[in-house]
Amino acid sequence: PSPPPEKKELRKVAHLTGKSNSRSMPLEWEDTYGIVLLSGVKYKKGGLVINETGLYFVYSKVYFRGQSCNNLPLSHKVYMRNSKYPQDLVMMEGKMMSYCTTGQMWARSSYLGAVFNLTSADHLYVNVSELSLVNFEESQTFFGLYKL
Amino acid sequence: PSPPPEKKELRKVAHLTGKSNSRSMPLEWEDTYGIVLLSGVKYKKGGLVINETGLYFVYSKVYFRGQSCNNLPLSHKVYMRNSKYPQDLVMMEGKMMSYCTTGQMWARSSYLGAVFNLTSADHLYVNVSELSLVNFEESQTFFGLYKL
Amino acid sequence: PSPPPEKKELRKVAHLTGKSNSRSMPLEWEDTYGIVLLSGVKYKKGGLVINETGLYFVYSKVYFRGQSCNNLPLSHKVYMRNSKYPQDLVMMEGKMMSYCTTGQMWARSSYLGAVFNLTSADHLYVNVSELSLVNFEESQTFFGLYKL
C-alpha cells in the first residue's frame, strides 16, 4: 500500500501592523484586519508568543514623524520576555539622535531584522521611546517573524 | 525497488538590482546581469510576477543622494497590483523628510522587508517619489523576494 | 520494514554580534557569547565562510554614533571574497552623508539584507568607513545569514 500523504505543516509566521490606540509600552498591534498574518504563533497584549522552539527571522519597522523637530532621542527595540528569566532581553535595537533640522516637519524610519533561536513560551515585543511620534499606518509600522 | 529520487523543487526567488534607465514609475530593474537572481518568478515591466500562491518575504532598498540638499520629501514604496483589484495595495513604505543640511551633498538609504501572503498573478512593484535622486548601483538599490 | 528515520539536516545559520576590539577592516564579530548563532557555517577572521553552495539571505546592521557631529561620510558594506576571484564583490552597501547637526551628539543605523547565491568557500565580510564611530552593542551591530 502507498504511504499516507505527507501532512503539510502550517508555516509559523506573523506580520502585524501598527495600531493607533497604543497608549503605553509595549506597542500594540493590529492582528486581525488588513495585510495581517498570524499562523502558528499567538498574539497576546502586544506580544508574539512562540509555541515551538526553533530558529526564527524576526523583523520590525517603525515610522517616526513630527511637525516641529526637537530632536528628541528615538529608540526602537525588539525584546524578549520569558517567565524563566528575570529580565527582558533586547534582541535588536535602533537609536536616532540629531536626525532632523530644528523646527522642520520631519519623518524617519527604523528597520530591524535578524535570526534568533527562540524557545516555546518566549514572548516578543516592540518598544519605542517616543510613542507620540509614531505613525501607525499599516505599510509604515509593522512587526513580524517566520520560522526558518 | 528503491523509491524514485525526490524531485528537488526550484526555489522561488528574485534579487533584482538598480537599472539607471528607469525613466518613470514603477522603477525598472536589472534582471539579467551581475548579482541578479530570478527563479520561479517572472519579471515584467518593472514588476515581479508571482506564479504560485504562498508566503513570501519581500524586500527592497533604495539609495537616495543629491549634490545640494533641499530636503524634498522622499518616499519608497513596495506595492502590489492584481487585475482582480481596482487599486494598488501599498505593502510597505518608507518616508523621509528633513534628513539633511540645506545645500550640502547628502546620501541616505531606505530599507523595507516583510512577509506577505501573495497570490498567483500578483504583480509587485517599487515606487519612489524622486527618481532623479536615486542612485542605481547594484549594491545600493535592489528589490527581491523569496518563497518561505 | 519501516524506512529509517529521516535525518534532520542542521540549518545553516549565523548571527554574530558586535565586537568592540575590532581594530581594522573587516569588522570582527562575537561568535561565542550572548545571542550568537553559528551552525553549518564557519567564522574566520571577521568572515562567515560558506561550506555549501546555495541561496542565502544575508543581513547586517551597524550602529554609528558620535559626540560631536562633523558629518564624516559613513559607509557600511557586506562583501564577498573567494580565492577564485581577484577582487572583492560588494553585495550590499549603505552610505550616509549630511545626516546630523554639526557639533551635536548623534546616532544612526544602517541596515542591509538580501538574497544571494553563494558558493562553497565564499567568505563574507562587513566593512565600515569610520570604525571609531561604530558602537558594538550586541543588539545594535550584527551580521548574519541563513540558507533558504
Epitope: Q67, N70, P73, S98, S132 | - | Q104
Partner: antibody
C-alpha cells in the same frame, strides 16, 4: 497648568541688544520646541525662529539671521531670544510659544514682552 | 516662502450672525493627506490663542461654534453664531515648512 512666563518690558537705544526670556512650567520643557513671534504696534504676527529645547540649536527666519540668537537653559526650563543691532522698527511685542512635535500648531503662548527702541 | 493672504481685512457682523473668514496660501500647504493650516484669535493686549489646527480640528476648550475647512491653498474659518467675546483679530498661519508665515489678519468688528 502649562505656563510660559516672559521677562518684563524693555526700552533700548538703537544699536543696542535686548535679551528676552521665556520660562516654561507645568510640562516637560524639553519635549517641545520654542518658537519666537513678534508683533509691531498695530501690525500682524511675524515668525522669527525656533529653538530645540532638547538639542539647543535653532532655525531662523532669514530676515533675522545674524541678528537674532536663540538659546536655552534646560536646567531652569528657560528659552532666550537676543536681538542685536536694534533699530526703531524692532519696536514690538515679542512672544514665545511652545510647539508639540507630534501636533500641528503652537498651542501655548507667553504673555509677550514689549521692547521699545528709541533714542 | 509661502505667502498667506486673508480677506476681508475687516468684517462687520452682528451678534448671533454667521461670520466667514478666508485665507489663501501662495502654494499648497497640504502634505500626505493633512493640511498644515492653523487659525488663531487675538484680543487687544493679549497673546494669540489657538482655535483650529490642521485646517479643521478644534483645539481643546474652544467652543463648537468655531469651525475650519479647506485644503490646498484655500481655507475658511467660520463662526456660526457670533458672541460678544468673539470680536477680535483672527490670523491664519501655515506650518507646512519653515519659515512659518501668518496672514495679515482679519478684524472682526460689531456691526
Amino acid at each position: 497648568q502649562v505656563q510660559l512666563v516672559q521677562s518684563g518690558a524693555e526700552v533700548k537705544k538703537p544699536g543696542a541688544s535686548v535679551k528676552v526670556s521665556c520660562k516654561g512650567s507645568g510640562y516637560t520643557f524639553t519635549d517641545y520646541t520654542i518658537h519666537w513671534v513678534r508683533q509691531a504696534p498695530g501690525q500682524g504676527l511675524e515668525w522669527m525662529g525656533v529653538i530645540s529645547t532638547y538639542q539647543g540649536d535653532a532655525s531662523y527666519n532669514q530676515k533675522f539671521k545674524g541678528r537674532a540668537t536663540m538659546t536655552v537653559d534646560k536646567s531652569t526650563s528657560t528659552a532666550y531670544m537676543e536681538l542685536s543691532s536694534l533699530r526703531s522698527e524692532d519696536t514690538a511685542v515679542y512672544y514665545c510659544a511652545r510647539f508639540p512635535d507630534w501636533d500641528y500648531a503652537m498651542d501655548y503662548w507667553g504673555q509677550g514682552t514689549l521692547v521699545t527702541v528709541s533714542s | 516662502e509661502i505667502v498667506m493672504t486673508q480677506s476681508p481685512a475687516t468684517l462687520s457682523v452682528s451678534p448671533g450672525e454667521r461670520a466667514t473668514l478666508s485665507c489663501k496660501a501662495s502654494q499648497s500647504v497640504d502634505y500626505d493627506g493633512d493640511s498644515y493650516m492653523n487659525w488663531y484669535q487675538q484680543k487687544p493686549g493679549q497673546a494669540p490663542r489657538l482655535l483650529i489646527y490642521a485646517a479643521s480640528n478644534l483645539e481643546s476648550g474652544i467652543p463648537a461654534r468655531f469651525s475650519g475647512s479647506g485644503s490646498g491653498t484655500e481655507f475658511t474659518l467660520t463662526i456660526s453664531s457670533l458672541q460678544s467675546e468673539d470680536f477680535a483679530v483672527y490670523y491664519c498661519q501655515h506650518s507646512r515648512e519653515l519659515p512659518y508665515t501668518f496672514g495679515q489678519g482679519t478684524k472682526l468688528e460689531i456691526k
